[in-house]
Interface confidence: low
């Protein structure tokens, strides 16, 4: 029976490196002469780089290397024919047999990855990310799909802001250069990256990285039409309300990032809820077309928001929006009013008072404190009624006389705000005077409805 023995040895091993042991079995007494075996290598295939790459210890069967030059990339396997002879190896009297020793040369990382070109080229549109810019290719003579072959790429220069990254394609071992942060053409029109390739494991001792382990990648940035932008955005201006139509408020212009494209920007109005404004399409000048009113329902917290569009004439055309916030300073353009507009009191004044409050759509200091008064005419008003200011916002209306017949009376109240100059208004308070129970509640509602109007008489 012909035996096959398998062993391994790393490439580049020094002479004297143990490889494997072969042993033969002899049924004779091992202590007798005819049982004492001796081993020798009969042949080695292939015979490169030397026909005697290995030796065998003739007594133990240990195979070791005796020559340098094991190189997996040249010879991946050696086949040795081993002869065992008894009678201590005496060729005349001894009996012999042969076996095969198959020695596989295993890979070590003795070959660095080398770029297939000194310079690679790629291009990227500005502002785009996650796209492949260039494909880097390397060669590596080590065993494919092992850590000694797998390439790891890094950018060693030319990318101070970290805009690029390189991933390895696990199948092809190529380096895929991708953009990970957007690039602005107006800032960087080209990048020249220095890239290096290494393996996943360090190179074997004594092996150096050659110049071919580095390369350059020349990336051209392509100019793309970008949105014009308003700055500042929002733009805040303070302006008194009540401005006449035709007043120039401000200029709200946009910048176009595309410095290398000859473009014009045109302005249009996107949103102007009260239709108070117009914008010059060429120079962005904003002019009023109506009176600005802080008290308008379109003004929230004193701020009026209008939105404008800046459009360029690039291909394709791009646009950006900007918000103008007009902080409207109050003027005293609203006269105060009295609330409620209707009230009830009893025929006899005790203990009834009508609490009234002021409503002014303006704000401090054009609102309260308010002054409350009764007119001099008709004389019955001041004769029958009295008004007492409780504080800046509240007053009380009371009957001055001890009795007033049930009915509905219109009491004019003069109310004046604290604006400079102040604004006054005469508010009519409809007072239902009625007969009341001991709790001060009206008992004759039906009769009041039919009663005629009086003016405090």
């Amino acid at each position: 029976l012909h035996q096959v023995w398998n062993g391994t040895v790393p490439e580049g091993s020094k002479p004297g490196t143990y490889v494997m042991t072969v042993t033969a079995i002899d049924a004779d007494d091992p202590n007798a002469l005819n049982g004492m075996l001796r081993y020798r290598i009969v042949s080695q295939a292939p015979s490169t780089p030397s026909p005697n790459m290995f030796t065998i210890n003739n007594e133990t069967g240990d195979i070791i290397t005796v020559a340098a030059g094991l190189d997996r990339e040249k010879v991946q396997q050696y086949t040795l024919i081993i002869q065992a002879t008894d009678m201590e190896g005496n060729p005349t009297y001894g009996l012999s047999n042969t076996a095969t020793a198959v020695i596989t040369v295993t890979d070590v990382n003795d070959n660095p990855p080398e770029f297939t070109a000194m310079t690679f080229y790629g291009e990227v549109p500005e502002n785009r990310v996650d796209i492949i810019v260039a494909n880097l290719t390397v060669t590596d003579k080590d065993q494919p799909h092992t850590p000694a072959w797998n390439a790891v790429y890094r950018i060693s220069g030319g990318d101070p802001t970290g805009r690029f990254a390189i991933q390895t394609d696990p199948n092809s071992n190529d380096g895929l250069v991708t953009v990970v942060k957007p690039i602005d053409f107006e800032t960087n029109r080209m990048f020249v990256l220095t890239v290096a390739a290494e393996n996943q494991v360090p190179l074997a001792k004594g092996i150096q990285h050659p110049p071919q382990s580095t390369a350059t990648v020349s990336v051209t940035v392509i100019d793309v039409n970008e949105n014009p932008y308003f700055a500042p955005n929002p733009k805040i201006i303070r302006q008194e309300e009540g401005l006449h139509a035709g007043t120039m408020l401000t200029t709200f212009t946009a910048q176009d990032p595309d410095r290398y494209m000859q473009q014009n920007i045109r302005y249009t109005k996107l949103s102007d809820p009260a239709n108070w404004l117009k914008i010059d399409p060429v120079n962005g000048q904003i002019t009023t077309i109506a009176v600005l009113d802080r008290e308008s329902p379109n003004v929230k917290n004193n701020i009026y928001n209008a939105t404008f569009l800046a459009s360029d004439n690039g291909i394709p055309p791009m646009s950006g929006t900007g918000t103008l916030q007009i902080y409207l300073l109050d003027i005293n353009d609203n006269a105060p009013q009295v609330l409620p507009q209707e009230a009830e009191t009893c025929e006899t004044p005790d203990p009834n008072s009508i609490n009234i409050t002021a409503l002014d759509y303006d704000i401090d200091p054009n609102a309260g404190p308010f002054a409350f008064d009764l007119p001099l005419s008709p004389v019955t008003i001041k004769r029958n009624w009295t008004i007492t200011r409780l504080n800046g916002d509240f007053a009380q209306l009371n009957l001055k006389i001890k009795f007033l017949e049930a009915g509905i009376y219109e009491v004019p109240i003069i109310i004046t705000d604290s604006g400079n100059p102040p604004k006054s208004n005469i508010s009519i308070l409809r007072v239902k005077v009625c007969q009341c129970d001991s709790n001060g509640d009206c008992t004759d509602v039906d009769r009041i409805v039919g009663a005629g109007l009086g003016t405090g008489a």
């Epitope: 303070r238 917290n301 004193n302 701020i303 902080y327 300073l329 409050t357 704000i363 401090d364 200091p365 504080n391 800046g392 916002d393 604290s418 604006g419 400079n420």
Partner: antibody, heavy 119, light 107 residues
């Protein structure tokens, strides 16, 4: 930046008057109401009144309208609050504060002035 | 004048817990005019929440404000050590008043 800097601590006897100042900087003085608020030791906040430098309008808390006087010197962006006929329960930290653009909140405050009324 | 009543007067909680402070108005107050301030010992009050629910500049988003018709709340989702202070509500709708304050203290 917006700042309201108040005058230093005062010690007064009952019946006396005290005049506190609040100097504004970092904003247009005539565009904002300046409020005065006080805080007695361990107590809450109590509004005294406001002064509007734009028109000279003044509004007082009814409780203080007979004893508090608010004035201003627009040339030095300063508002004053004088409190007369001092009582021991007027011992408090007095703050000035700026009313914000809308909603009536106080967005910037002075550091406060301690007034101690003691015989 | 509108009276603002804050409850509880004192809230004893541990860091990491949720705090809910209440402010009840004696009559209706527009949400635009109800505000909250934080005050720490020896310092002026600082605007914390304005117009019921808007956080002032630099206030962390663990704070929030809300309202019913006359009830207003300030909520702190997870108390941090720096949140222990007195909080005041304030209205400027009719005249001008402050609540009595709620002291949030470490349990």
């Amino acid at each position: 930046q917006v700042q309201l800097v108040q005058s230093g601590a005062e010690v007064k006897k009952p019946g006396a008057s005290v005049k506190l100042s609040c100097k504004a900087s970092g904003f247009t003085f005539t565009d904002y109401l300046i409020q005065w608020v006080r805080q007695a030791p361990g107590q809450g906040l109590e509004w005294i009144g406001w002064f509007y430098p734009g028109s000279g309008s003044i509004k007082y808390n009814e409780k203080f309208k007979d004893r508090a006087t608010l004035t201003a010197d627009k040339s030095i962006n300063t508002v004053y609050m004088e409190l007369s006929r001092l009582r021991s329960d007027d011992t408090a930290v007095y703050f000035c504060a700026r009313r914000g653009d809308w909603g009536g909140f106080f967005d910037y405050w002075g550091q406060g002035t301690l007034v101690t009324v003691s015989s | 004048d509108i009276v603002l009543t804050q409850s509880p007067a004192t809230l004893s909680l541990s860091p990491g817990e949720r705090a809910t402070l209440s402010c009840t108005a004696s009559s209706s107050v527009s949400s635009s005019y109800l505000h909250w301030y934080q005050q720490k010992p020896g310092s002026a009050p600082r605007l914390w929440i304005f117009s019921t629910s808007n956080l002032a500049s630099g206030i962390p988003d663990r704070f929030s404000g809300g309202s019913g018709s006359t009830d207003y709340t300030l909520t702190i989702s997870r108390l941090e050590p720096e949140d222990f202070a007195v909080y005041y509500c304030h209205q400027y709708h009719r005249s001008l008043t402050f609540g009595g304050g709620t002291k949030v203290e470490i349990k």
